[in-house]
């Protein structure tokens, strides 16, 4: 098995994680997605789940935590609005397949958020005050209660940073986007990985 | 390695039918949505249409200028692609080509070497 | 209908100098700050070939002299420096809304 790497994302308090899971294959629209932690030593404890089976373009909101999925599109959008110095630790974004395990749709994210705020790398430096908004009518869905620490991955991304406000209502400042465009597979054997119901090792495509 | 092979092409007449295939080897086909594109000689590209896959209960898109006359269909089990075209029109006259997206809206990275097909009287 | 307008409609560059390629979108083609925008190249008796996918991805196997950028309505296609197997005909399309679109195609040659 090949070993899962990890993302460095360094941001400020206040500021917000933007990440797009990129799932593409059809089969996958309506499964129930989830956004996990992973602690050291511990199993991922999925913090927030798109309902089951997962609605189009509906958000669901857990906290600060944002889940968007366009089924249309093949897209998980994940947000952390407001982030908090305790928010850092390991993410991962996943889709169930009950009673299989989890597929993992990226390279985990090792996410560092420091105390006061200033513009990202390669951000304009203008739009430091720049307003976010969250969607107003959000649902809360129950997500399954079993882990597990194997996934299978779905393609590296490639990460940008970015700023942007998109429209909707509820106003936070002080927010920059990190948004994690992800690359698609081209390799057919790795598409054959993907796709094998059998197939459930780690597989990091490079 | 990724084929797509376009074949049922030929000479109809205007009003006349045409059915055309497209078989896929070389990655698992009930996976992806099929399309097809045409490109009438010395035009530009023209999308057809799409089929989605069993678990987007194989819905069909197509392009209004053929909308109505053709049909895209397929067989997971023959690795397969069909377009019916019915009604044949002079502007119908085009190389069509099979095309294989990388997921959900995706890029077309596969294309068949394309099949001519001629409506004349 | 998204319509897909490129410029120019043929463009003729010397050896070793820039092209452009520009494509504008009657509407918007991004999702979830994705741009659903390719663009293909196609050389006379072939089927078009893709280039860059969303926006500014290179295909596997593509020149790193090929880039792509844009987002929303706005994009363009770059050859950094045109080599003369560039000389095609390219075209971009859109695949965030059905019924997918491609632009009228740009003849590119060498002056």
């Known amino acids: 098995a090949t070993k899962l790497t990890e993302e460095k994302y360094e941001l400020k308090e206040g500021q917000t994680l933007d990440v797009k899971c990129d799932y593409t294959l059809e089969k996958f629209a309506s499964s129930q997605k989830a956004w996990q932690i992973i602690r050291d030593g511990e199993m991922p404890k999925t913090l927030a789940c798109t309902e089951r089976p997962s609605k189009n373009s509906h958000p669901v909101q857990v906290g600060r935590i944002i889940l968007e999925d366009a089924h249309d599109h093949g897209l998980l959008r994940v947000r952390m609005v407001n982030l908090q110095v305790e928010d850092s630790g390991l993410y991962q974004c996943v889709i169930y397949q009950p009673p299989k395990e989890p597929h993992m749709l990226f390279d985990r994210i090792r996410l560092v958020v420091t105390k006061g705020f200033s513009g990202t790398p390669g951000s304009n430096e203008n739009s430091t005050q720049n307003v976010y908004k969250i969607p107003p009518t959000t649902t809360k869905a129950l997500c399954p209660l079993y882990t597990s620490p194997r996934t299978v991955t779905q393609a590296p991304p490639k990460s940008t940073a970015d700023v942007s406000t998109p429209d909707s209502e509820i106003n936070l400042t002080n927010v920059t986007d990190i948004i994690r465009e992800q690359k698609l597979i081209s390799e057919e054997d790795l598409e054959q990985k993907l796709i094998s119901e059998e197939d459930l090792h780690h597989h990091h495509h490079h | 390695e990724v084929q797509l092979v376009e074949s049922g092409g030929g000479l109809v007449q205007p009003g006349g039918s045409l059915k055309l295939s497209c078989a896929a080897s070389g990655f698992t086909f009930s996976t992806y949505a099929m399309h097809w594109v045409r490109q009438a000689s010395g035009k530009g590209l023209e999308w057809v249409g799409r089929i989605r896959t069993k678990s987007s209960n194989y819905a069909t898109y197509y392009a209004a200028s053929v909308k109505g006359r053709f049909t895209i269909s397929r067989d997971d089990s023959k690795n397969t692609a069909y377009l019916q075209m019915n009604s044949l029109k002079t502007e119908d006259t085009a190389v069509y080509y099979c095309?294989?997206?990388?997921?959900?809206?995706?890029?077309?990275?596969?294309w068949g070497q394309g099949t001519l097909v001629t409506v004349s009287s | 209908d998204i319509v897909l307008t490129q410029s120019p409609d043929s463009l003729a560059v010397s050896l070793g100098e820039r092209a452009t390629i520009n494509c504008r979108a009657s509407?918007?083609?991004?999702?979830?700050?994705?741009?659903?925008l390719h663009w293909y190249q196609q050389k006379p008796g072939q089927p078009p070939k893709l280039l860059i996918y969303?926006?500014?991805n290179l295909e596997s196997g593509v020149p790193d002299r090929f880039s792509g950028s844009g987002s929303g309505t706005d994009f363009t296609l770059t050859i950094s420096s045109l080599q003369a197997e560039d000389v095609a005909v390219y075209y971009c399309?859109?695949?965030?809304?059905?019924?997918?679109?491609f632009g009228q195609g740009t003849k590119l040659e060498i002056k």
């Open positions: 509407e918007s083609v991004d999702t979830f700050d994705y741009s659903f």
């Open positions: 095309t294989r997206d990388m997921g959900i809206r995706r890029q077309f990275a596969y």
């Open positions: 399309q859109q695949s965030n809304e059905d019924p997918y679109t």
């Open positions: 969303r926006a500014s």
